[in-house]
């Protein structure tokens, strides 16, 4: 699987995490920081 950084256009897409471009799947994916969940890492959980 080819992985690269998301384009600068996606700055701010992942609220609490890192945006990863899964090239082969044509998808942006948010890798959430510890304590966050959701498609865009928008939810905090304890």
């Amino acid at each position: 699987v080819s992985i690269t950084k998301c384009s600068s256009d996606m700055n701010g897409y992942c609220l609490h995490g890192q945006c990863i471009y899964l090239v082969d799947m044509s998808q942006n994916y948010c890798r959430c920081e510890v304590g966050y969940t959701g498609v865009r890492c928008e939810h905090f959980f304890l």
Partner: antibody, heavy 118, light 106 residues
């Protein structure tokens, strides 16, 4: 499955405004960005702008800045494009497209023809 | 704003011919370039993204290459169903389409 259903064709007078809707199904628009693209007769595709429905932040092409407003209603999973001060040059097919989780536009609405005529 | 200059604006080729379209960006777009096929009355169809990655279900006769500011799209053997207008799209910083290339059969 992912679907984007746009509102029907419109005929408007010069100087008027038009509002086109794009109802999403199969996904939550808060997980994405929603973009608008248009194509005038015998012209190319033009990106107009986008909205982040999670926070209502918008970005517009400078060509349309001040005349275009993109909004989203997350309760109905719908994005809107409003274009004001219409002229005959705004006669075009207007498309919504999903961004965000899709780096490029894979999913498009069916297009809405807006005709501006006196 | 990033500008995309696409050429030629139109071309005519025979079935089986190799067709090549170029797109030049006004600044480095880091391979964030896609190619679309657009037929009248239809929504545009994604063919290639990230310069050279074929979208699932797209025939292998379509290909893309390039980096930085200069990009190329090719159809290795033109088929009748390939008659359409083709657009490049940069998605590094917001979005900009090239002017389009109308492909016709001789």
């Amino acid at each position: 499955q992912v679907q984007l259903q746009q509102s029907g064709a419109e005929v408007k007078k010069p100087g008027a405004s038009v509002k086109v809707s794009c109802k999403a199904s199969g996904f939550n628009i808060k997980d994405t960005y929603m973009h608008w693209v248009r194509q005038a007769p015998e012209q190319g595709l033009e990106w107009m702008g986008r909205i982040d429905p999670l926070n209502d932040k918008t970005k517009y092409d400078p060509k349309f800045q001040g005349r275009v407003t993109i909004t989203a209603d997350t309760s109905t999973n719908t994005a809107y494009l409003e274009l004001s001060s219409l002229t005959s040059e705004d006669t075009a097919v207007y498309y919504c497209a999903r961004g965000g989780g899709d780096p490029v536009f894979v999913y498009w609405g069916q297009g809405t023809l807006v005709t501006v005529s006196a | 704003d990033i500008q995309m200059t696409q050429s030629p604006s139109s071309l005519s080729a025979s079935v089986g011919d190799r067709v090549t379209i170029t797109c030049k960006a006004s600044q480095d777009i880091n391979k964030y370039l896609a190619w679309y096929q657009h037929k009248p009355g239809q929504a545009p169809r994604l063919l290639i993204h990230y310069t050279s990655t074929l979208h699932p279900g797209i025939p292998s006769r379509f290909s893309g290459s390039g980096s930085g500011t200069d990009f190329t799209f090719s159809i290795s053997s033109l088929q009748p169903e390939d008659i359409a207008t083709y657009y490049c799209l940069q998605y590094d910083n917001l979005r900009t389409f090239g002017g389009g290339t109308k492909v016709e059969i001789k």
